[in-house]
């Protein structure tokens, strides 16, 4: 019951945080202009992995999509395959414990097969996780380096008579939409592992030993139960959940009453 | 078609107090305060988000100025308070639009401080 | 604050002539999200609110006549009228659309010659 439970939970956790990193990864606000002293601004920039937007004072936000790939950073490349291989890993280890749960019946699958099923979505889940909180930690720290670098340089111009301010940036939600999806992918993935331990029926069987009673002539024999899992390969005394398989580029947008500035 | 009247104009004595009303038909999403002294160019006093009452003001104004809004009565208001000489002006309000600019204008209504 | 500076204050034209006003901007203006410059132009006459023109620097407001042009970047921006009408003496103003607080240039009046 245990490891249906872990397995259940894994799965779930591993759910929401595959479905996390999915939004993470289309979010626009990876990172977001800076306001610092000033938190009403005529024009606010913040940028995705795939586009960058501008939200004006006067309700209206203009996108643009980055319609080149030889043009941008190696960086930004390499986020973006992270989390594409991250959702990747994450989707087709999704499928595979589907199959895995111990909650769904196929045919006659054996305990082993989910075993071996849950642990190879376990270990997807886990390098999914791994890949997408990389991605993040990989663009906050181009985002770190990129603030600094423009705070050194806040203020460039021509005798210090026309000032250009430079657009600083800070961490976006997707940051940490991308962290917590990771962490909780990785977390499910770890649980699917542990529940795989709990399916997989130990190699070795006790031999038959009779036991005489004494004054009786009654032998007992255990009938080669598999040690300590409780869920042997016997199928006389092996439960079976029989009931039945359960299914558990430029865009304008017009202001709305939902766009803060 | 965005309609903007403004009203609540008139004299009133330094150190006085006035509210402007600007009554708003259409679809705003933030909207502007602008005044012109007469003879004089134009002079940004404040902008509002309709929806979320968020402020913000010109340094000149911070303090004495306050803009609002009636979301039940689609309605702008600029209170202005310790009036003095120099406010003497034509008060506008404008909605603003793409690019930060202000497409629509009400009429103005002429404040004038003076004993 | 930016402060915003018009040339010529006022100058003196004839029907059909290409005026020419310069407006500058003591910081650039020039969004680097979008690559647009937010600065914009109005028209006023005698007694009348102000009229949008041009905003992003060069984008013309609907229903403003294409004789209108804008152009310009980062501290420098120009509106030029290529052939001025009879309803073109009018009073433009520059205004900084970029960051709060918005500030308008002093104007320049264009007058009939």
């Known amino acids: 019951m245990a490891v249906t439970a872990c397995q259940g939970l894994g799965f779930v956790v591993s759910l929401i945080g595959i479905a996390g990193i999915i939004a993470a990864t289309c979010m626009d606000q990876w990172s977001t202009q800076d306001l610092y002293n000033n938190p009403v601004t005529a024009v606010f920039n913040y940028q995705g992995l795939w586009r960058s937007c501008v939200r004006e004072s006067s309700g209206f936000t203009e996108c643009r999509g980055y319609f080149t790939l030889l043009g941008l950073p190696a960086m930004l490349q390499a986020v973006r395959a992270l989390m594409i291989v991250g959702i990747v890993l994450g989707a087709i280890g999704l499928l595979v414990s589907i199959f895995a749960l111990k909650c769904i019946r196929i045919g006659s699958m054996e305990d082993s097969a989910k075993a071996n099923m849950t642990l190879t979505s376990g270990i997807m889940f886990i390098v999914s996780g791994l890949c997408a909180i990389a991605g993040v930690s990989v663009f906050a720290n181009m985002l770190v380096t990129n603030f600094w670098m423009s705070t050194a340089n806040m203020y460039t111009g021509m005798g210090g008579m026309v000032q250009t301010v430079q657009t600083r940036y800070t961490f976006g939600a997707a940051l940490f939409v991308g962290w917590v999806a990771g962490g909780l992918t990785l977390i499910g993935g770890v649980m699917m592992c542990i529940a795989c331990r709990g399916l997989a029926p130990e190699e070795t069987n006790y031999k038959a030993v009779s036991y005489h009673a004494s004054g009786h002539s009654v032998a007992y024999k255990p009938g080669g139960f598999k040690a300590s899992t409780g869920f042997g390969s016997n199928t006389k005394n092996k439960k079976i959940y029989d009931g039945g398989a359960r299914t558990e580029d430029e865009v304008q947008s017009y202001p709305s009453k939902h766009d803060y500035v | 078609e965005v309609q903007l009247v403004e009203s609540g104009g008139g004299l009133v004595q330094p150190g006085g107090s006035l509210r402007l009303s600007c009554a708003v038909s259409?679809?705003?999403?933030?909207m502007n305060w602008v005044r012109q002294a007469p003879g004089k160019g134009l002079e940004w006093v404040a902008w509002?988000?309709?929806?979320?009452?968020?402020?913000t003001y010109a340094d000149d104004f911070k303090g004495r100025f306050t803009i609002s809004r009636d979301d039940s009565k689609n309605t702008l208001y600029l209170q202005m308070n310790s009036l003095r000489a120099e406010d003497t002006a034509v008060y506008y309000c404008?909605?603003?639009?793409?690019?930060?600019?202000?497409?629509?204008w009400g009429q103005g209504t002429l404040v004038t401080v003076s004993s | 604050d930016i402060q915003m500076t018009q040339s010529p204050s006022s100058l003196s034209a004839s029907v059909g002539d290409r005026v020419t006003i310069t407006c500058k901007s003591s910081q650039s203006l020039l969004n680097s999200g979008n690559q647009k410059s937010y600065l914009t132009w109005y028209q006023q006459k005698p007694g009348k609110a102000p009229k949008l023109l041009i905003y992003?620097?060069?984008t013309l407001e609907s229903g403003v006549p294409s004789r209108f042009s804008g152009s310009g970047s980062g501290t420098d921006y120009t509106l030029t009228i290529s052939s001025l009408q009879p309803e073109d003496f009018a009073t433009y103003y520059c205004q900084n659309a970029y960051s709060f607080p918005f500030t308008f240039g002093q104007g320049t009046k264009v007058e009939i010659k």
């Open positions: 992003w620097a060069s």
């Open positions: 259409g679809y705003t999403f933030s």
């Open positions: 404008a909605r603003a639009s793409r690019g930060n600019g202000m497409d629509y």
């Open positions: 509002i988000n309709m929806y979320t009452g968020e402020p």
